[in-house]
């Protein structure tokens, strides 16, 4: 099962990865 560290809740919807400053990494909990 894949979960996220953090949340997209506070991220503004950006038009791509070029403007992203912080990455929510995938965490493999399997």
């Amino acid at each position: 099962v894949k979960s996220k560290i953090g949340s997209t809740e506070n991220l503004k919807h950006q038009p791509g990865g070029g403007k992203v400053q912080i990455i929510n990494k995938k965490l493999d909990l399997s």
């Epitope: 996220k4 997209t8 919807h13 950006q14 791509g16 990865g17 400053q21 990494k25």
Partner: antibody, heavy 120, light 112 residues
Framework: QVQLVQSGAEVKKPGSSVKVSCKAS????????ISWVRQAPGQGLEWMGE????????YYNEKFKGRVTITADKSTSTAYMELSSLRSEDTAVYYC?????????????WGQGTLVTVSS | DIVMSQSPLSLPVTPGEPASISCKSS????????????LAWYLQKPGQSPQLLIY???TRESGVPDRFTGSGSGTDFTLKISRVEAEDVGVYYC????????FGQGTKVEIK
């Protein structure tokens, strides 16, 4: 498990509109972007646009601006793509895909595709 | 708009042999803040929806065999299959998500 289930095939007349649905399950619908991608017969993949259901914010491919509208209903976890002023060149398989917005920005799950045929 | 160009467009392969596909973008896909290249690879098998193979240019998606390797940075990227298997046939697409989304034209991999 994550699933994206699309509506069935459509046959449309030139000049009319089509609305394709994409019902998501197995994850939190609001946390991911839904992208729409089409594929004309024997051709490659073409990104049409996307929506972030949490806010309703959208981005579109300039090629389709003014003709395509992407919406989402959080209460039913369903995204919609409506394409208007249809012409024969719009005959294609239309896919929705879950886009891992905020991290990889990659489409990790895809719907089964919806064939839209535009013919007089 | 960011333009993606793939080569070759057709790639006949022999099972057990390596294969390589090139993808070039019209501008850099590297975000200097995140140090990630926003480049993904997809495989569309005959009659199926596309499936994600690689994201961030070199990170394999869960469940993707390790014979698939993505590399490159900036504007030049490569997908390598160390030993092609019969199930690998289909059309491979690169896609940028640095700004909006653009797919390459696709590379059709078929068994010789």
């Amino acid at each position: 498990q994550v699933q994206l289930v699309q509506s069935g095939a459509e046959v449309k007349k030139p000049g009319s509109s089509v609305k394709v649905s994409c019902k998501a399950s197995g994850y939190t619908f609001s946390d991911y972007v839904i992208s729409w991608v089409r594929q004309a017969p024997g051709q490659g993949l073409e990104w049409m646009g996307e929506i972030f259901p949490r806010s309703g914010s959208t981005y579109y491919n300039e090629k389709f601006k003014g003709r395509v509208t992407i919406t989402a209903d959080k209460s039913t976890s369903t995204a919609y793509m409506e394409l208007s002023s249809l012409r024969s060149e719009d005959t294609a398989v239309y896919y929705c895909a879950r886009d891992y917005y905020g991290t990889s920005f990659a489409m990790d799950y895809w719907g089964q595709g919806t064939l839209v045929t535009v013919s007089s | 708009d960011i333009v993606m160009s793939q080569s070759p467009l057709s790639l006949p392969v022999t099972p057990g042999e390596p294969a390589s596909i090139s993808c070039k973008s019209s501008q850099s896909l590297l975000n200097s803040r995140t140090r990630k290249n926003y480049l993904a690879w997809y495989l569309q098998k005959p009659g199926q929806s596309p499936q994600l193979l690689i994201y961030w240019a070199s990170t394999r998606e869960s469940g993707v065999p390790d014979r698939f390797t993505g590399s490159g940075s900036g504007t030049d990227f490569t997908l390598k299959i160390s030993r092609v298997e019969a199930e690998d046939v289909g059309v491979y697409y690169c896609k940028q998500s640095f700004y909006l989304r653009t797919f390459g034209q696709g590379t059709k991999v078929e068994i010789k």
